[in-house]
């Protein structure tokens, strides 16, 4: 296994609809054809998997149907979008990239993106 550099933004603020997007860029040392991208969340001394997708270079990134993540890939960049976020989901979201094929296997872990989620205030009752 070999190490690989992964870059991602330090901070992202989720939209009022609970959607956060960020780019995960990896420095591919070779010509990988199969790449696995995993989003991890670190909070309260625990790391949990948020979502994961394996894709072939040049093809679309496909997450499971019930995943809260969507994404697109372009070269060595993956554009990730996480939806359905609430204030309690605030935390450090880490991009993990694995070059699965061809060998050798490479592993890269980003420094994490701190995603802040603010629940919208409920609208006051209107007389109209």
């Amino acid at each position: 296994c070999k190490a690989m550099h992964v870059a991602q933004p330090a901070v992202v603020l989720a939209s009022s609809r609970g959607i956060a997007s960020f780019v995960c860029e990896y420095a591919s040392p070779g010509k990988a054809t199969e790449v696995r991208v995993t989003v991890l969340r670190q909070a309260d001394s625990q790391v949990t998997e948020v979502c994961a997708a394996t894709y072939m270079m040049g093809n679309e990134l496909t997450f499971l149907d019930d995943s809260i993540c969507t994404g697109t890939s372009s070269g060595n960049q993956v554009n990730l979008t996480i939806q359905g976020l609430r204030a309690m989901d605030t935390g450090l979201y880490i991009c993990k990239v694995e070059l699965m094929y061809p060998p050798p296997y490479y592993l890269g872990i980003g420094n994490g993106t701190q995603i802040y989620v603010i629940d919208p205030e409920p609208c006051p009752d209107s007389d109209f």
Epitope: T48, L92, G112
Partner: nanobody
Framework: EVQLVESGGGLVQPGGSLRLSCAAS????????IGWFRQAPGKEREEVSC????????NYADSVKGRFTVSRDNSKNSVILQMNSLRAEDTGVYYC???????????????????WGQGTQVTVSS
Amino acid sequence: EVQLVESGGGLVQPGGSLRLSCAASGGTLDYWSIGWFRQAPGKEREEVSCISGTGLRTNYADSVKGRFTVSRDNSKNSVILQMNSLRAEDTGVYYCTGKLLHPSLWSACANEYDLWGQGTQVTVSS
């Protein structure tokens, strides 16, 4: 709250083997840096081994190099210390320690640890 629990200690003859396990209750050890320490009677506690959060880096004290092997068993949410060719001087209480570092340090062993287990006794004697 995560707690560390060691198991696998016991009495073994010189030259024998033991397999210590460090498991987590109340959470997972995924990406935690895990260290193994031991304390022999009348001696200071010493670190014998550690494994990084990714599992790619392992360190060993000179006294156990080539005899001890540390590994992660993610399927069982545990870290294993395989001890071979045991000697009388390996006798002591073995402690599992852990710390979840910032992701930028997941490929390294921790310099200090937040969490300690209760320890398991290892006795090497004929």
